[in-house]
Interface confidence: medium
């Protein structure tokens, strides 16, 4: 901060801080003060400090969702869009395309298949999968979508699953599944979506997506 | 603020602000101060300011969800309830009825059809649609619910969609669709829900709803 | 707070608070001040207070999701897992097992059937139910899952419902329902999930869950 250079005369410090000591005494409940009422003093000073803080919040750029409550607590959120894949894996592929969200580098899409977070905390994680299947052309087993977690040094685990029996509609019947829940993630944890048959997934606009938000 | 009218005598300003200049010097790291240790000064003053701020947060009425972190960052959330409509449009109609939520005027329900936000930011937006349809009585195409975005000066965009093939149950078979995702909205942006056949939508308590919350 | 005991000399209070009165006047727009420019005074003081507040935010422990924005605003979230029950009630049973979440004692699972909150506010509440049913073996009525609210001194009410017609698959066809919405809860309010036939609910890992998060 720039110094108040226009002030040249400095009084003895033991006088200067009587101001603070007095407020301090007000705050700790001492009532030996004359002339000024403690509540008056405190309310005036509190009012001013609150004005400052209000002003501090007003000057935050409202058009940025990256930073919230200071650099210490940025918003962390992602929403990615399904991508058709020639891979035979049951793990769905995603892309940062269309109307996607990637708030900052505290959440990343890795290898097009998993959302990885850098900060520990509670996250609401969700996935939506639309698929088209036919009972006769599919296996007996239902179509299952699973939201899975891989934390560093730990085995994968299923967080959420949904199951829908195949439709009798021809050539196939479309159905949509939505999964969502609150989970604690460790730094470096990744979440991904598994389905029983990726070839049945619908990739038209908005049909299949995956995301999270940090509480 | 009310002025401290009980104080009538004013000293020369060059004296009054030595207080602040001294704290300032403490803050900028100057160590030419006698009598009082900077850390002591700063810690006392910080403690008091923090008490004020803590007190500021404590005195917020906890039964009000309107304001959060000062007027600059109020909670923004809405949950509206479906309304049957004689309109032929595919856009669903909503109402602030039943157990609805409308946190403040930073989100509004416009023309009974769209939720409009005043602040830019990340929002979790969701919709739930329950419908009753029959394969024979409906078109070949599935029932599709779309969550759409209209930003000022832009075309509408589909954010999310879900599709369910019609049931073979008679007279009709009920099914529920849930959509939800995180999206950045611009000031003045509106979100609304489109369905292929609004006449098939179920409007019983809790079956069809629409909402959002700002992260 | 410890008093500034090193300060022994106390000046007349009418002098001590000229400092605050002057800043106050600056703040209220009075421009009768000489020597020092109000903007300079205010900006110096604001800067220091903001530094304090920044420092306050920096010292928050990042690895704890329990406390957010001070003790006044802890994170409140829960995610519980379905539990098979021999009870004949239509209310689903839940447990803190598997990868569950229970942020703190401001939300609790009571009697294994309801999530109860201690603080008033806006909550995003969700439930997912997977069930397996057959049209011939079930009643005509669809399978319905309801998210219900019980507030102290008030009747229960339905917040959200979803309905799915039974499958024609044999022995039964699986389907998943997801419910979610933003609602204001009062202190002591409880939310629970009702289904038409609990015996049809699937309790495999991740299939059926229930949770909430406070905005």
């Amino acid at each position: 901060h720039r110094r108040l250079d226009k002030i040249e005369d400095e009084r003895n410090l033991h006088e200067d801080f009587v101001f603070m000591k007095t407020i301090q005494r007000c705050n700790t409940g001492e009532r030996s003060l004359s002339l000024l009422n403690c509540e008056e003093i405190k309310s005036q000073f509190e009012g001013f400090v609150k004005d400052i803080m209000l002003n501090k919040e007003e000057t935050k750029k409202e058009n940025s969702f990256e930073m919230q409550k200071g650099d210490q607590n940025p918003q962390i959120a992602a929403h990615v869009i399904s991508e058709a894949s020639s891979k035979t894996t049951s793990v769905l592929q995603w892309a940062e395309k269309g109307y996607y969200t990637m708030s900052n580098n505290l959440v990343t899409l890795e290898n097009g298949k998993q959302l990885t977070v850098k900060r520990q905390g509670l996250y609401y994680i969700y996935a939506q999968v639309t698929f088209c299947s036919n009972r006769e052309a599919s296996s007996q087993a239902p179509f299952i979508a699973s939201l899975c977690l891989k934390s560093p040094g730990r085995f994968e685990r299923i967080l959420l699953r949904a199951a829908n029996t195949h439709s009798s509609a021809k050539p196939c019947g479309q159905q949509s599944i939505h999964l969502g829940g609150v989970f604690e993630l460790q730094p470096g944890a990744s979440v991904f979506v598994n389905v029983t048959d990726p070839s049945q997934v619908s990739h038209g606009t908005g049909f299949t997506s995956f995301g999270l938000l940090k509480l | 603020h009310r002025r401290l009218d009980k104080i009538e005598d004013e000293r020369n300003l060059h004296e009054d602000f030595v207080f602040m200049k001294t704290i300032q010097r403490c803050n900028t790291g100057e160590r030419s101060l006698s009598l009082l240790n900077c850390e002591e000064i700063k810690s006392q003053f910080e403690g008091f300011v923090k008490d004020i701020m803590l007190n500021k947060e404590e005195t917020k009425k906890e039964n009000s969800f309107e304001m959060q972190k000062g007027d600059q960052n109020p909670q923004i959330a809405a949950h509206v309830i479906s309304e049957a409509s004689s309109k032929t449009t595919s856009v669903l109609q909503w109402a602030e009825k039943g157990y609805y939520t409308m946190s403040n005027n930073l989100v509004t329900l416009e023309n009974g059809k769209q939720l409009t936000v005043k602040r830019q930011g990340l929002y979790y937006i969701y919709a739930q649609v329950t419908f009753c349809s029959n394969r024979e009585a409906s078109s070949q195409a599935p029932f599709i619910a779309s969550l759409c975005l209209k930003s000022p000066g832009r075309f509408e965009r589909i954010l999310l969609r879900a599709a369910n093939t019609h049931s073979s149950a008679k007279p009709c078979g009920q099914q529920s669709i849930h959509l939800g995702g995180v999206f950045e909205l611009q000031p003045g942006a509106s979100v609304f829900v489109n369905v292929t056949d609004p006449s098939q939508v179920s409007h019983g308590t809790g079956f069809t709803s629409f909402g959002l919350l700002k992260l | 707070h410890r008093r500034l005991d090193k300060i022994e000399d106390e000046r007349n209070l009418h002098e001590d608070f000229v400092f605050m009165k002057t800043i106050q006047r600056c703040n209220t727009g009075e421009r009768s001040l000489s020597l020092l420019n109000c903007e300079e005074i205010k900006s110096q003081f604001e800067g220091f207070v903001k530094d304090i507040m920044l420092n306050k935010e920096e010292t928050k422990k990042e690895n704890s999701f329990e406390m957010q924005k001070g003790d006044q605003n802890p994170q409140i979230a829960a995610h519980v897992i379905s539990e098979a029950s021999s009870k004949t009630t239509s209310v689903l049973q839940w447990a803190e097992k598997g990868y569950y979440t229970m942020s703190n004692n401001l939300v609790t699972l009571e009697n294994g059937k309801q999530l109860t909150v201690k603080r008033q506010g806006l909550y995003y509440i969700y439930a997912q139910v997977t069930f397996c049913s057959n049209r011939e073996a079930s009643s005509q009525a669809p399978f319905i899952a309801s998210l219900c609210l019980k507030s102290p001194g008030r009747f229960e009410r339905i917040l959200l419902r979803a309905a799915n017609t039974h499958s024609s698959a044999k022995p039964c066809g699986q389907q998943s329902i997801h419910l979610g919405g933003v609602f204001e809860l009062q202190p002591g309010a409880s939310v629970f999930v009702n289904v038409t036939d609990p015996s049809q609910v699937s309790h495999g890992t991740g299939f059926t869950s229930f949770g909430l998060l406070k905005l």
């Epitope: 395309k97 269309g98 | 449009t89 595919s90 856009v91 209209k150 000066g153 075309f155 509408e156 609304f192 | -």
Partner: antibody, heavy 118, light 107 residues
Framework: EVKLVESGGGLVKPGGSLKLSCTTS????????MSWVRQTPEKRLEWVAS???????YYFDSVRGRFTISRDNARNILYLQMSSLRSEDTAMYYC?????????????WGQGTSVTVS | DIQMTQSPASLSASVGETVTITCRAS??????LAWYQQKQGRSPQLLVY???TLAEGVPSRFSGSGSGTQFSLKINSLQPEDFGSYYC?????????FGTGTKLELK
Amino acid sequence: EVKLVESGGGLVKPGGSLKLSCTTSGFTFNNYAMSWVRQTPEKRLEWVASISSGDSTYYFDSVRGRFTISRDNARNILYLQMSSLRSEDTAMYYCARHYDYDSYAMDYWGQGTSVTVS
Amino acid sequence: DIQMTQSPASLSASVGETVTITCRASETIYSYLAWYQQKQGRSPQLLVYNAKTLAEGVPSRFSGSGSGTQFSLKINSLQPEDFGSYYCQHHYNTPLTFGTGTKLELK
């Protein structure tokens, strides 16, 4: 097969009116945004107006207040009501469907109907 | 309004050659750019949207690239049916605007 067929064009005097129609088939009309685009005699393409699946309307500045775009979802027809016509409105008018992906590019166009203001 | 500047205005090439047409937007349009082909006496046909995604049925010799303000359409190994006019169009906001067109002629 997706089909768009324009009609209603012709010769009209300045200040006159004309109503163009675009009859569609082969797709679920009410799920799509639709537009009118014109091509001037100099072969320049100009967007004229659009209507979303939710019935929101958008207009090119030079036609706003004079032209009205509308749709009849029951009959799968798109309309363009043109009034206060000017010589600079002379063009081939195409109706087009907006592509159903994250894009509002136009994937199907009609064969066009000619409008001459003279 | 966003202006779309297309170049060149005309281009002569032979069958089998590779050609590139460029389009510049007056401000960023991210990836919201489409390319159309129009043959004499016909209506425009969508080739590419979102700057690089080929529309259904479009041969793989066509490719789009670019983002922000600079875009290009490349046609590898020109075929006789590729001759005609090409237009770029942004689909970022209203008003939608088109480039002035590039006439691709047989040399």
